[in-house]
């Protein structure tokens, strides 16, 4: 059916809109566009005759319309008046007419809004502030953002005036944030510049950072003072009661034991006139220098090289510590520490050994950490993978293959077809393939640093016809009530229908059967012994239909609870006892017997000649299936009576 799609549907003034025609009939004489919902000569915009390729403007033509040979209409420099319906009138070669109507709406581009405020310097826990979003605009939605997030839910925040006004009651220092308002209509959304609310408060009691009070000789002392305050506090430092400087930070390089003492920070708020102080006591100890790591091999090759990391400097009577990935060393036969723990050796490095590695020197107060060291392990390339996984393509399509191999440094790629080099790129593209493009496609990945190369070969067949399919399985011997089995119909080909049959019948409806991957994969969940049937897949495309050979599922099950036969439990003295045990199981189970708990023989049949009352007791048959790992058993009580003492007793075999 002929339809018109407006792209976009909501149009901004000054922009353009395309009235896109879908399902245009073939064999056309021409077509015309009209403003409105019907064909009206007075409102014709433009007409087009296919035979002459002539476009003729109509009364409603504004000079902003362009008609395309596919009948689509482009209207440029849109104005508000363009809103509404547009009708396409199509005249087919047989002079039968078709009509379709589309529409779009025009909206103005919104101006950038701004925020006005009724109080520029509110005081914490005292004042309220009202923000208003300007200008007031019809058909616009107003939104507010605090620190680029939508408004939090708070009883102190209130929206009014159609969301144009945001009021903050009883402001706190936490309301000191970036406020923006936004106006929206269907074609535009504009945000104001941010307005920062300036709440006056403080100063609070200052905090001195860092918190640690113990330092090494030779370190730099860098203390920072901060007190929450608006306007920002003015800071002063005192050491042992003596004024030092009026700065927020106190910096003393290369400190000595003499720099130990009490350090006072004073914060002052010029607006409130308040002062607050905090004192910290600093102790300076004589200490070793910061450690660092040296390596005997900065670019080791995976599975070939060992790396020895050494913690410097060497200091007598010092404890050395190591960390990998910010964790203590894992237990691994590939990680070796020297007697003094100063050297960490990684034997036969792998790509997972990159680190980071840190060493530390322990002293009486703390542990000094080295800077982290990362190993650049050279590896690969691994076997490249070629995607997509299709092996069959139909003539006329584009062939686009991508190759990837894990490698450090990244691999360099080459493509060969039937052994002939094509190009040195990661992707291979051949347009409009034919049968002649069938062949062996080789991706070669090369690692320039290790000098290693790996290749993957993919056979690609370009054919309208598909080959005989085959079924691959992810589990050849599934266990009953435990395993799932996924059958996949090979090969994977584009534009192909995949079908399945079980024992020559179409698939039964079952929650345990699931088709996926475009019906190419059939999964049986929680297999049962009844699933041990013949599975066939079929493939069908435009020119061919074919079926796989059947695959019979071998479900391992059991052993079920065994049965001992004969069922008799009473025997006469002197009879032969011949008990047979059977349990349903795949594969066949192993049998063993116990009499009164004492192991007997590992046979399916238990035979005792000329039994006596001494043979009374419990006879247990044990079955075990090594493939399923399951066991089962049954116990039978046997009573042997002295000859002739009781009627109805079995004479035995």
């Amino acid at each position: 059916k002929l339809t018109i799609e407006s792209t976009p549907f909501n149009v901004a003034e000054g922009k353009e809109v395309l009235l896109l025609v879908h399902n245009l009939p073939q064999h056309l004489f021409g077509y015309s566009w009209y403003k409105g919902e019907r064909v009206d000569g007075n409102r014709q915009i433009i007409g087009y005759v296919i035979g002459t390729q002539q476009a003729t403007p109509g009364p409603a033509y504004s000079g902003r319309e362009i008609i395309y040979p596919n009948a689509s209409l482009l209207i440029q420099n849109i104005i508000q008046n363009d809103t509404g319906f547009y009708t396409l009138h199509v005249i087919k070669s047989d002079l039968v007419n078709e009509e379709a109507t589309g529409q779009f709406r025009v909206y103005p581009e919104l101006p950038k809004p701004s925020i006005s405020s009724n109080n520029s310097k509110p005081v914490e826990d005292k004042d309220a502030v009202a923000f208003t979003c300007e200008p007031e605009t019809q058909d616009a939605t107003y939104l507010w953002w605090v620190n680029n997030q939508s408004l939090p839910v708070s009883p102190r925040l209130q929206l009014s005036n159609g969301n144009r006004t945001l009021t903050l009651f009883n402001v706190t220092r936490n309301d000191t944030a970036s406020y923006k308002c936004e106006t929206q209509n269907p074609v535009s959304a504009r945000r104001s510049d941010s307005v920062i609310l300036n709440v006056l408060y403080g100063p609070d009691a200052p905090t001195i950072s860092p918190l640690n009070t113990s330092y090494r000789s030779g370190e730099n002392l860098n203390l920072s003072c901060h007190a929450a305050s608006n306007p920002p506090a003015q800071y002063s430092w005192f050491v042992n009661g003596t004024f030092q400087q009026s700065t927020q930070e106190l910096f003393i390089p290369n400190i000595t034991v003499n720099n130990s003492g009490s350090y006072t920070c004073q914060a002052h708020n010029s607006d409130t006139g308040l002062n607050r102080t905090t004192v910290t006591t600093i102790t300076v100890y004589a200490e070793p220098p910061k450690p660092f790591i040296t390596s005997n091999n900065s670019n080791p090759v995976e599975d070939e090289d060992a790396v020895a990391l050494t913690c410097e400097p060497e200091i007598q009577n010092t404890t050395y510590l190591w960390w990998v990935n910010n964790q203590s060393l894992p237990v691994s036969p590939r990680l070796q520490l020297s007697n003094d723990n100063r050297t960490l050796t990684l034997l036969s490095v792998t790509r997972n050994d990159v680190g980071p590695y840190e060493c530390g020197i322990q002293n009486e107060l703390s542990v000094d950490h080295s800077d982290p060291v990362i190993l650049n392990v050279l590896y690969g390339p691994d076997d490249p993978t070629i995607s997509p996984s299709y092996t069959y393509y139909r003539p006329g399509v584009n062939l686009s293959l991508s190759c990837h191999a894990a490698s450090n440094p990244p691999a360099q790629y080459s493509w060969l077809i039937d052994g002939n080099i094509q190009q040195h790129t990661q992707e291979l593209f051949i347009s409009n393939i034919t049968e002649k493009n069938s062949g062996l496609y080789t991706c070669q990945a090369n690692n320039s640093a290790s000098g290693h190369s790996r290749t993957t070969v993919k056979t690609i067949t370009v054919s309208a016809e598909l080959p005989k399919p085959s079924i691959s399985s992810n589990n050849s011997k599934p266990v009953e009530d435990k395993d799932a089995v996924a059958f996949t119909c090979e090969p994977e080909a584009q534009n192909t229908t995949y079908l399945w049959w079980v024992n020559g019948q179409s698939l039964p409806v079952s929650p345990r059967l699931q088709l996926s991957n475009g019906n190419r994969t059939l999964t049986l969940f929680n297999v049962t012994r009844n699933d041990a049937r013949a599975y066939v897949c079929g493939i069908q495309n435009s020119v061919s239909a074919n079926r796989s050979d059947p695959v019979t599922l071998d479900v391992l099950y059991g052993p079920d609870t065994p049965i001992i036969s004969p069922p008799d439990s009473s025997y006469l003295s002197g009879a032969n006892l011949n008990l047979s045990c059977h349990s349903a199981s795949n594969p066949s189970p192993q049998y063993s017997w116990r009499i009164n708990g004492i192991p007997q023989q590992h046979t399916q049949v238990l035979f005792i000649a000329k039994i006596t009352p001494n043979n009374n007791g419990t006879y247990a048959c044990f079955v075990s299936n090594l493939a399923t790992g399951r066991n089962n058993s049954i116990v039978k009580s046997i009573t042997v009576s002295a000859s002739g003492t009781s009627p109805g007793l079995s004479a035995g075999a």
Epitope: A464, P467, Q540, N541, S544
Partner: antibody, heavy 120, light 106 residues
Framework: QVQLVQSGAEVKKPGASVKVSCKAS????????MHWVRQAPGQGLEWIGW????????EYDPKFQGRATMTADTSISTAYMELSRLRSDDTAVYYC?????????????WGQGTLVTVSS | EIVLTQSPDFQSVTPKEKVTITCSAS?????MHWFQQKPDQSPKLWIY???NLASGVPSRFSGSGSGTDYTLTINSLEAEDAATYYC?????????FGQGTKLEIK
């Protein structure tokens, strides 16, 4: 069971067009590609092309491209093959044909054929 | 396009005799398919994918071959086998048929 029933014989003049229909029953026409094959009197089989009734995709033998048009109306399970600008050597029996895996075995079904005679 | 050439064009054979029809393709194909057609009847798929007998086809028929050379064999001809046999390739567009081999019973 699966059946393909074609329209009756046609006699046409050179330059005219003919439209042969093929009504399917016993299966969903959308699930199978419909092929068209013709056979001139006393001659062999000649493939014309196929249509996918589900989406209207077609593939033609280049020698029929531009003259043959295959269409389908899935609502009435019918496929059509129209051949225009007929010539006397277009005189042939025209068959519709499907290749399907509706059973576990590939099956091939053919219409009974439509004889088109082109004569002045 | 791929040209299929059947040999022979015509063969007159006595019942119980073994019959071999060959089909040679101008370019290698994946499979060959064979059709049987009797006078005033539509063609019937006879052998699909080179060697698989279609439903209802007697076991005296067999198919073989690969690449460019394919064969249809009737082990012991029977009267009902009198017909024209066509090979067809579906590997490449356009699909093509051989010119046909007519079998006649002596």
């Amino acid at each position: 069971q699966v059946q393909l029933v074609q329209s009756g014989a046609e006699v046409k003049k050179p330059g005219a067009s003919v439209k042969v229909s093929c009504k399917a029953s016993g299966f969903n026409i959308k699930d199978n590609y419909m092929h068209w094959v013709r056979q001139a009197p006393g001659q062999g089989l000649e493939w014309i092309g196929w249509i996918d009734p589900e989406n209207g995709d077609t593939e033609y033998d280049p020698k029929f491209q531009g003259r043959a048009t295959m269409t389908a109306d899935t609502s009435i399970s019918t496929a059509y093959m129209e051949l225009s600008r007929l010539r006397s050597d277009d005189t042939a029996v025209y068959y519709c044909n499907i290749i399907t895996m509706a059973t576990p075995y590939p099956m091939d079904y053919w219409g009974q054929g439509t004889l088109v005679t082109v004569s002045s | 396009e791929i040209v299929l050439t059947q040999s022979p064009d015509f063969q007159s054979v006595t019942p119980k005799e073994k019959v071999t029809i060959t089909c040679s393709a101008s370019t290698s194909v994946i499979y060959m398919h064979w059709f049987q057609q009797k006078p005033d009847q539509s063609p019937k798929l006879w052998i699909y994918s080179t060697s698989n007998l279609a439903s209802g086809v007697p076991s005296r028929f067999s198919g073989s071959g690969s690449g460019t050379d394919y064969t249809l064999t009737i082990n012991s001809l029977e009267a009902e086998d009198a017909a024209t046999y066509y090979c067809q390739q579906r590997s490449s567009y356009p699909l093509t048929f051989g010119q046909g081999t007519k079998l006649e019973i002596k």
